[in-house]
């Protein structure tokens, strides 16, 4: 058993049929010695008396809010949560496996630049009685500070018969140099509590590996005389690290119709303009990627050919 | 100060072309190592990230773009020793910091070159003959060093009398290649920045 936060405790349980469970001793936070009784949740049934209560925790029915009272007055609470371990593996029931970039990916993180700011998100099908707490650091043995905000519900989607909820959090490394060469990864830890179930999820990464620039901005077209070619120009996204001559991007320019199966024109360039062949009912799209370290491409910025 | 975004002709700054070749060569070598040593811990997640130039050179700090010198977090270990005369320096007006930056890059290359050559000598003794360093990568390191043209003491190649542990050598190769790729990215960024300046 360990303390998650004040008056909230996590009991780690090996989860299998007829498991013996864990013996837990609760102590009432009071100077009083006599006349103390214990109850669980909203029940008025007295579970025991005395300053301490010893319980055998085996299942979710044994978890919950234990309260010690004296003469009708509440003295203190202890909330017990369960953390299940099945076949030596901690349960991952609360969050959905996003399977990208690999299986058992519960947390996904992205950074728009090298400033040390990043966003992580996760998915769940659970809609109520759900709380998250996020901590982060650079390195684990001698951790350096990363500050994370509160996790918020950022999107809701319908997937078949199920509703899917996306939560996200923003974090900022306390003293980040955009030009630094990372040798210690960022660690992100998410505590998830659903009703009386506790789970924790972690992700470890270098900022350089989670870079995904914003799409290029200000796409403009200029038809070339006596030609089917069009000059397309754009600018670096505002959120990208500066100076741009140091943090350079490379671009992919594509002309395609509405369907991905349609024929297309595609060209890669380090410049902020390119010449392509425009077709009726097609769109010109441009995306960006770090020129020197190939992490993710940005989303497309698009303009219609016409 | 708004610096140009498009990459000018590499001929304007001879080191830019060589640094691009360096990044390409080390990336190819790392990819080859990951494929060939697929049953060794050779991915970024599996290896320890060591920097053999740590406390010996200060490339990131010495080569910091002017725009980032206002960032306190970038200035914790800025070094100031005076080194002059590299052939990549475009004019006499070149600042002292630029000379320091390029000499730091030169020292990095020299250290990695020695490490890679020592390692290659060991790998050539491996009866499995599983992996060797790409001669192209070693040549590209040499070309960039020549373009930088700093006078520097020769570092003797390390020779080891004991029987090499080939498993450890291959893991060390992965660690070295990962670190060198990150440094090659920095070098490429620096050359691009200097070229645009």
């Amino acid at each position: 058993i360990w303390e998650l936060k004040k008056d909230v405790y996590v009991v780690e349980l090996d989860w299998y049929p007829d498991a013996p469970g864990e013996m837990v001793v609760l102590t009432c936070d009071t100077p009083e010695e006599d006349g103390i009784t214990w109850t669980l949740d909203q029940s008025s049934e007295v579970l025991g008396s005395g300053k301490t209560l010893t319980i055998q925790v085996k299942e979710f029915g044994d978890a919950g809010q234990y309260t010690c009272h004296k003469g009708g007055e509440v003295l203190s609470h202890s909330l017990l949560l369960l953390h299940k371990k099945e076949d030596g593996i901690w349960s991952t029931d609360i969050l959905k496996d996003q399977k990208e970039p690999k299986n058992k990916t519960f947390l996904r993180c992205e950074a728009k630049n090298y400033s040390g700011r990043f966003t992580c998100w996760w998915l769940t099908t659970i809609s109520t009685d759900l709380t998250f707490s996020v901590k982060s650091s650079r390195g684990s043995s001698d951790p350096q500070g990363v500050t994370c905000g509160a996790a918020t519900l950022s999107a809701e989607r319908v997937r078949g018969d199920n509703k899917e909820y996306e939560y996200s959090v923003e974090c900022q490394e306390d003293s980040a140099c955009p030009a630094a060469e990372e040798s210690l990864p960022i660690e992100v830890m998410v505590d998830a509590v659903h009703k009386l179930k506790y789970e924790n999820y972690t992700s470890s990464f270098f900022i350089r590996d989670i870079i995904k620039p914003d799409p290029p901005k200000n796409l403009q077209l200029k038809p070339l005389k006596n030609s089917r070619q069009v000059e397309v120009s754009w600018e670096y996204p505002d959120t990208w690290s500066t100076p741009h001559s140091y943090f350079s991007l490379t671009f992919c320019v594509q002309v395609q119709g509405k369907s991905k199966r349609e024929k297309k024109d595609r060209v890669f360039t380090d410049k902020t303009s390119a010449t392509v062949i425009c077709r009726k009912n097609a769109s010109i799209s441009v995306r960006a990627q770090d020129r020197y370290y190939s992490s993710s491409w940005s989303e497309w910025a698009s303009v219609p050919c016409s | 100060r708004n610096l140009p975004v498009a990459t000018p002709d590499p001929g304007m700054f001879p080191c830019l072309h060589h640094s691009q070749n360096l990044l390409r060569a080390v990336s190819n070598m790392l990819q080859k190592a990951r494929q060939t040593l697929e049953f060794y811990p050779c991915t970024s997640e599996e290896i320890d990230h060591e920097d053999i130039t740590k406390d010996k050179t200060s490339t990131v700090e010495a080569c910091l773009p002017l725009e980032l010198t206002k960032n306190e977090s970038c200035l914790n270990s800025r070094e100031t020793s005076f080194i002059t005369n590299g052939s990549c320096l475009a004019s006499r007006k070149t600042s002292f910091m630029m000379a320091l930056c390029l000499s730091s890059i030169y020292e990095d290359l020299k250290m990695y070159q020695v490490e890679f050559k020592t390692m290659n000598a060991k790998l050539l003794m491996d009866p499995k003959r599983q992996i060797f360093l790409d001669q192209n990568m070693l040549a590209v390191i040499d070309e960039l060093m020549q373009a930088l043209n700093f006078n520097s003491e020769t570092v003797p190649q390390k020779s080891s009398l004991e029987e090499p542990d080939f498993y450890k050598t291959k893991i060390k190769l992965c660690i070295l290649l990962h670190a060198f790729r990150i440094r090659a990215v920095t070098i490429d960024r620096v050359m691009s920045y200097l070229n645009a300046s």
Epitope: K263, R266, V267, T269, R279, K280 | -
Partner: antibody, heavy 118, light 107 residues
Framework: QVQLVQSGAEVKKPGASVKVSCKAS????????LHWVRQAPGQGLEWMGW????????ESAPKFQGRVTMTTDTSTSTAYMELRSLRSDDTAVYYC???????????WGQGTMVTVSS | EIVMTQSPATLSVSPGERATLSCRAS??????LHWYQQKPGQAPRLLIY???QSISGIPARFSGSGSGTEFTLTISSLQSEDFAVYYC?????????FGGGTKVEIK
């Protein structure tokens, strides 16, 4: 599978014209861009131009502008390349090539040998 | 127009050996470069597109790298069926242009 079958060899006199055909099968002609590439005996490859069979848009290399005409007949899934004012240095194997991407060539015809000789 | 230069013109290699073919562009073309193989009496065949992207059905021994002005096609272990002429082609701008080819012959 996607295939391009070209017309047979031709022998032409200098100053004449030649029209080479290229029949597409295994796909709809309008779904791919179609290019013409030639290769003189013992020489390398030379790109001549492209056509978009969907709308008839064409672009040819400056060297061939005014001398080459590229057309398609979607009803027969056939593309044509006509080269006029033939010279002896036009002697080459002429290939049609197609791709969903405009700028490189995924599928090739077997080639048509055109000999220009007096 | 962009001029593509391939080297060497002829490469003599023993079966099982590694072959490295070079292609240089007269100006920077990013990764807009493609490689083809041509055997005598046959049409060319696409091997690699956009400098390093592999084609399904093409053996894994063929790999491409490079960007900007310098590109490499590597055949890791030459098989008898790999002896042919190899062409690079730029798609950075029109007109599309090919290199002069590298003939890989048996040593």
């Amino acid at each position: 599978q996607v295939q391009l079958v070209q017309s047979g060899a031709e022998v032409k006199k200098p100053g004449a014209s030649v029209k080479v055909s290229c029949k597409a099968s295994g796909y709809t002609l309008t779904d791919y861009y179609l290019h013409w590439v030639r290769q003189a005996p013992g020489q390398g490859l030379e790109w001549m131009g492209w056509i978009d069979p969907e709308n008839g848009d064409t672009e040819s290399a400056p060297k061939f502008q005014g001398r080459v005409t590229m057309t398609t007949d979607t009803s027969t899934s056939t593309a044509y390349m006509e080269l006029r004012s033939l010279r002896s240095d036009d002697t080459a194997v002429y290939y049609c090539a197609a791709n969903k991407e405009l700028r490189y060539f995924d599928v090739w015809g077997q080639g048509t040998m055109v000999t220009v000789s007096s | 127009e962009i001029v593509m230069t391939q080297s060497p013109a002829t490469l003599s290699v023993s079966p099982g050996e590694r072959a490295t073919l070079s292609c240089r562009a007269s100006q920077s073309i990013s990764i807009n470069l493609h490689w083809y193989q041509q055997k005598p009496g046959q049409a060319p065949r696409l091997l690699i597109y956009f400098a390093s992207q592999s084609i399904s059905g093409i053996p894994a021994r063929f790999s491409g790298s490079g960007s900007g002005t310098e590109f490499t096609l590597t055949i890791s272990s030459l098989q008898s069926e790999d002896f042919a002429v190899y062409y690079c082609q730029q798609s950075n701008s029109f007109p599309l242009t090919f290199g002069g080819g590298t003939k890989v012959e048996i040593k």
